[in-house]
């Protein structure tokens, strides 16, 4: 009787099924949708949790302009196609053979196409900025107080290291946070910045990810931090290949 | 990035054998875990067998005795006999680049899978 199997289950995502019938009494949590194994001390990969929740069941400004090629994601939910690590494969298509091409945070970055389109590589999402209004308060909050706590934030609870977290600026109410991670930077190990950024518009929506704790609680110097707004733009290492059309509508 | 392709699948009377191999690239494949995963129609997937980079073997009582796991690093390549098969073992069968954490069992990656069909 080990103590795996007197705690199995999966801290990161509690979209998983968990049985301490691993090797050797281990125990093994399973992600919904895709059946893998997830590492349970870390973040588990957007593409997986995505797989998950989709078979689930139904339930002087100091701010940053983002530049022309910031993609949000307006497609919303899908159902995507992951790799064999878990993560999103460069094309993506639907049950009725549409297709179009993704970014490693699963956003679509060109226009869709039938089952002849190509994506030649999964392009990296190499900056994120996190775009939040607070609700109104008696005053500001302190700017380095407010970067502090956010900083903590992703460092403690989605494991990102530190040096990925670019910049926390505010200008009340608003409130961004720039992430950035280059292929080169990132290495075995590190939490990528797509999956602490969705795991933290989850927490922001009151959709934890985490297994068995409280929703997210934002102080900042014991003020309650409550966002009424997000918006997240991702910035690719290439550029997107939409239409003209798309990009004058 | 990792790739991981199965073969040796197919269709066998029950008490039969099978060998299923793995070809493995984009990754130190003599330094890596690796294991064997089932998943049957209708139900969720089980591993079946677990190698350590060391050698080490694991196995589930459901196939403990009939079923080896083995690799030859040379190769990058794992392998599965299955001996004395049953119809309950009919399903796809898919190799796993894995770990062993203090506490859980981890697949860091898996192929596509190969089918394995027990019947006469």
């Known amino acids: 009787h080990t103590a795996a199997q007197d705690n199995c289950t999966c801290p990161t995502n509690k979209m998983t099924v968990c049985s301490p019938d691993g090797p050797g009494g281990r125990c093994q949590c399973r992600a919904l949708g895709s059946g893998m194994a997830v590492d349970c001390s870390t973040l588990t990969s957007k593409c997986l949790l995505l797989k998950a929740r989709m078979s689930a069941p139904k339930n002087a400004r100091t701010l940053v302009r983002p530049s022309e090629h910031a993609l949000v994601d307006n497609d919303g939910l899908y159902d995507p196609d992951c790799d064999p690590e878990g993560r999103f494969k460069a094309r993506q298509c639907n049950q009725t053979s549409v297709c179009w091409c993704v970014n490693s945070v699963g956003v679509r970055r060109t226009d869709k196409g039938d089952l002849s389109l190509r994506c030649d590589e999964l392009v990296r999402t190499h900056h994120i900025l996190i775009d939040l209004r607070h609700r109104p308060t008696a005053g500001a909050f302190n700017h380095s107080d407010l970067d502090a706590e956010l900083r903590r934030l992703f460092r403690e609870r989605y494991r990102l290291h530190p040096k990925f977290v670019a910049a926390v600026h505010y200008e009340q109410p608003t409130i961004q946070i720039e992430l950035r991670q280059n292929t080169s930077q990132k290495a075995a190990g590190d939490v990528d910045i797509g999956d602490a950024a969705y795991y933290f518009e989850r927490d922001i929506k009151g959709e934890s990810l985490f297994q068995g704790r409280g929703g997210l609680d934002l102080r900042v110097r014991g003020e309650p931090l409550q966002v009424e707004r997000t918006l997240i733009y991702y910035l690719d290492e290439i550029p997107p290949k939409f239409s003209m059309k798309r990009l004058t509508a | 990035q990792v790739q991981l392709q199965e073969s040796g699948g197919g269709l066998v009377q029950p008490g039969g054998s099978l060998r299923l191999s793995c070809a493995a690239s984009?990754?130190?494949?003599?330094?890596?875990?690796m294991s064997w995963v089932r998943q049957a129609p209708g139900k969720g997937p089980e591993w079946v067998s677990y190698i350590t980079s060391g050698g080490t073997t694991y196995y589930p009582d459901t196939v403990k005795g009939r079923f080896t796991i083995s690799r030859d690093n040379s190769k990058n390549t794992l392998y599965l006999q299955m001996n004395s098969l049953k119809p309950d073992d009919t399903a796809v069968y898919r190799c796993a680049k894995s770990r062993l954490t203090d506490s859980h069992y981890v697949e860091d990656a898996w192929g596509q899978g190969t089918q394995v069909t027990v019947s006469s």
């Open positions: 984009g990754f130190t494949f003599s330094g890596s875990d």
